[in-house]
Interface confidence: low
């Protein structure tokens, strides 16, 4: 048994048939020594009296809200909350695995920039009686701090029958150099409680690994005489790092029909121009990535070729 | 130790282009390691990350941009406080910063050299033949020595007598490179703020 | 070390479909901006670029060969295989493979490998 | 589609003299240019991408230069193992296209 927060416990539980459960001593907090009786949750059912109580915990049963009391007054409270633990694996019932870039990614993250701050994102089918909360640092063994915001409902969506809810936080290292070499991954530990289940998930990441730029801005188009061609020009993204001669991004240049099937010329380049062929009813997309370490290609920006 | 922002030296350009070929060098061997060695611990998140330049070079801090002296987290590792008088990050060829940061890559560029060649010579010993240093990537290292022009004495590769760890030496690759791969791309960076400067 | 090899019939008949395999080590065209094309030499005459395909399998062709060409890749095996109908002897000429990373232009060729169309 | 034309058709230089081979794109490529050496009987080399970057192991007599329509590739001091023909490459936009070939030869 470990204490999460002030007057809330985790109990971690083997969980197989007829499993012997742990034994907790629960304290009640008062200088009180004489007269105290224990309840569960709502219940007026007297479990034991005295400053402690011994209680087996084997499921989901034994686990809630225990409260001691003297004469009618609540002294204090401990909630208990059950980790399961299944053929040695702790349950993942709470997250969903987004199974991308590989099996078993409950969290996802990525950074705009080298600045230290990052957004991780995490969905669940559960809608309600659902708490979360993470804790980030560099490194583990002597950890440098990074402060994260609270999670939030970020989207709904429907999927088949099902509705599916995507939670997100955003992380701020305390102290980053943009152009410092990670030696330290960052670690996003996210505790989430599910009425009285609780599940951690863990990320371990270098910035550098999971930056995505935003997509190139001010796409224009410029016609040139007497030709189909046009001169595509775009801007590095606001939140791109500087200078951006240290810190450059190279371009991919798509013109792609109005069908998907249709053929898509793409073009590269470390310049903010190209120029290409627009056909009728196609359109132009650009997207970026760090010149010198290859993470994730930004989304599209795009325009009509019209 | 930033870099100063001046007109750019005709003699950048071959600079820019070697660190160029270095990283797509190292970034080629490195993925040749990860698939060769694919049943060793290779890949980012097995490996510890250590770098070999530690405490010997400061590459980072002596070729940081100009616009990032005014943030504290870049400065910290500091020992030496930045010189902002102008006048003498006049011109590039003159600029001591400039001297420090491009001598601190030649430093970084030696000392990977020499564990590389060294590494090289016992995975040759390998009865298994298994995998191998790129000779190109070698080639490049030294072009961009080369390049950068500096005279420093020889070091002399280590030599063992004992018979090598192949298992720990391959894991010893990995982490090398790596850290090379990392180490390259702030070259390229550093190699590409000077050219625009 | 990075290689590439053109593998394929030397003579085809006019109308018939040529396809021409390139097997590749030393890269993967698993991962990042790689691609492989193919290119032809007609006897004594200049290069002319006929197809490209990217890791992620974008393609794209010559526009005046569009209609005839296929190109396809193996990832598993290592190999990119162009395919040219309604062979002519026009067409008459040495095929290259070449790999294309994204800032070096085609820095890797095949050996070629000749092919004649004649009946 | 781009057209690269190459001038001359082919150049004859005396051992140690400087070789300037020229290539005109019929619109602007920016400096998406590549410069390639072919030998007889072996496929063509690359020798310049990105218009004046040389590639590895290229020796630095060669060099190349321009920028939007006109390219240049440079032999400063001719080898007898540089007779080869040289062909000039776009790769700014599709489809790439190459020049006709310079033949370079000793005179």
């Known amino acids: 048994i470990w204490e999460l927060k002030k007057d809330v416990y985790v109990v971690e539980l083997d969980w197989y048939p007829d499993a012997p459960g742990e034994m907790v001593v629960l304290t009640c907090d008062t200088p009180e020594e004489d007269g105290i009786t224990w309840t569960l949750d709502q219940s007026s059912e007297v479990l034991g009296s005295g400053k402690t109580l011994t209680i087996q915990v084997k499921e989901f049963g034994d686990a809630g809200q225990y409260t001691c009391h003297k004469g009618g007054e609540v002294l204090s409270h401990s909630l208990l909350l059950l980790h399961k633990k299944e053929d040695g694996i702790w349950s993942t019932d709470i997250l969903k695995d987004q199974k991308e870039p590989k099996n078993k990614t409950f969290l996802r993250c990525e950074a705009k920039n080298y600045s230290g701050r990052f957004t991780c994102w995490w969905l669940t089918t559960i809608s309600t009686d659902l708490t979360f909360s993470v804790k980030s640092s560099r490194g583990s063994s002597d950890p440098q701090g990074v402060t994260c915001g609270a999670a939030t409902l970020s989207a709904e969506r429907v999927r088949g029958d099902n509705k599916e809810y995507e939670y997100s936080v955003e992380c701020q290292e305390d102290s980053a150099c943009p152009a410092a070499e990670e030696s330290l991954p960052i670690e996003v530990m996210v505790d989430a409680v599910h009425k009285l289940k609780y599940e951690n998930y863990t990320s371990s990441f270098f910035i550098r690994d999971i930056i995505k730029p935003d997509p190139p801005k001010n796409l224009q188009l410029k016609p040139l005489k007497n030709s189909r061609q046009v001169e595509v020009s775009w801007e590095y993204p606001d939140t791109w790092s500087t200078p951006h001669s240290y810190f450059s991004l190279t371009f991919c240049v798509q013109v792609q029909g109005k069908s998907k099937r249709e053929k898509k010329d793409r073009v590269f380049t470390d310049k903010t121009s190209a120029t290409v062929i627009c056909r009728k009813n196609a359109s132009i997309s650009v997207r970026a990535q760090d010149r010198y370490y290859s993470s994730s290609w930004s989304e599209w920006a795009s325009v009509p070729c019209s | 130790r930033n870099l100063p922002v001046a007109t750019p030296d005709p003699g950048m350009f071959p600079c820019l282009h070697h660190s160029q070929n270095l990283l797509r060098a190292v970034s080629n061997m490195l993925q040749k390691a990860r698939q060769t060695l694919e049943f060793y611990p290779c890949t980012s998140e097995e490996i510890d990350h250590e770098d070999i330049t530690k405490d010997k070079t400061s590459t980072v801090e002596a070729c940081l941009p100009l616009e990032l002296t005014k943030n504290e987290s870049c400065l910290n590792s500091r020992e030496t406080s930045f010189i902002t008088n102008g006048s003498c990050l006049a011109s590039r060829k003159t600029s001591f910063m400039m001297a420090l940061c491009l001598s601190s890559i030649y430093e970084d560029l030696k000392m990977y050299q020499v564990e590389f060649k060294t590494m090289n010579a016992k995975l040759l010993m390998d009865p298994k033949r298994q995998i191998f240093l790129d000779q190109n990537m070698l080639a490049v290292i030294d072009e961009l020595m080369q390049a950068l022009n500096f005279n420093s004495e020889t070091v002399p590769q280590k030599s063992s007598l004992e018979e090598p760890d192949f298992y720990k030496t391959k894991i010893k690759l990995c982490i090398l490179l790596h850290a090379f791969r990392i180490r390259a791309v702030t070259i390229d960076r550093v190699m590409s703020y000077l050219n625009a400067s | 070390e990075v290689t590439l090899r053109e593998s394929g019939p030397a003579l085809v008949k006019p109308t018939q479909t040529l396809t021409l395999t390139c097997t590749f080590s030393?890269?993967?065209?698993?991962?990042?901006?790689?691609?492989v094309s193919w290119i032809r030499q007609p006897p004594g005459k200049a290069l002319e670029w006929l197809a490209h395909?990217?890791?992620?399998?974008?393609?794209y062709y010559n526009p005046s060969l569009k209609s005839r060409l296929t190109i396809s890749k193996d990832t598993s095996k290592n190999q990119v295989v162009l395919t040219m109908t309604n062979m002519d002897p026009v067409d008459t000429a040495t095929y290259y493979c070449?790999?294309?990373?994204?800032?070096?232009?085609?820095?890797?060729w095949g050996q070629g490998t000749t092919v004649t169309v004649s009946s | 589609d781009v057209v690269m034309t190459q001038s001359p058709d082919s150049l004859a230089v005396s051992l140690g003299e400087r070789a300037t081979i020229n290539c005109k794109a019929s619109?602007?490529?920016?400096?998406?240019v590549a410069w390639y050496q072919q030998k007889p009987g072996q496929p063509p080399k690359l020798l310049i991408y990105?218009?004046?970057n040389r590639y590895t192991g290229v020796p630095d007599r060669f060099s190349g230069s321009g920028y939007g329509t006109d390219f240049t590739l440079t032999i400063s001091s001719l080898q007898a193992e540089d007779v080869a023909v040289y062909y000039c490459?776009?790769?700014?936009?599709?489809?790439?296209?190459f020049g006709g070939g310079t033949k370079v030869e000793i005179k």
């Open positions: 395909i990217y890791w992620d399998d974008d393609k």
């Open positions: 070449t790999r294309r990373g994204i800032r070096s232009a085609m820095d890797y």
């Open positions: 990105y218009a004046s």
């Open positions: 030393g890269f993967s065209l698993r991962k990042s901006v790689m691609g």
């Open positions: 490459q776009q790769d700014y936009n599709s489809p790439w296209t």
């Open positions: 619109q602007s490529v920016s400096n998406d």
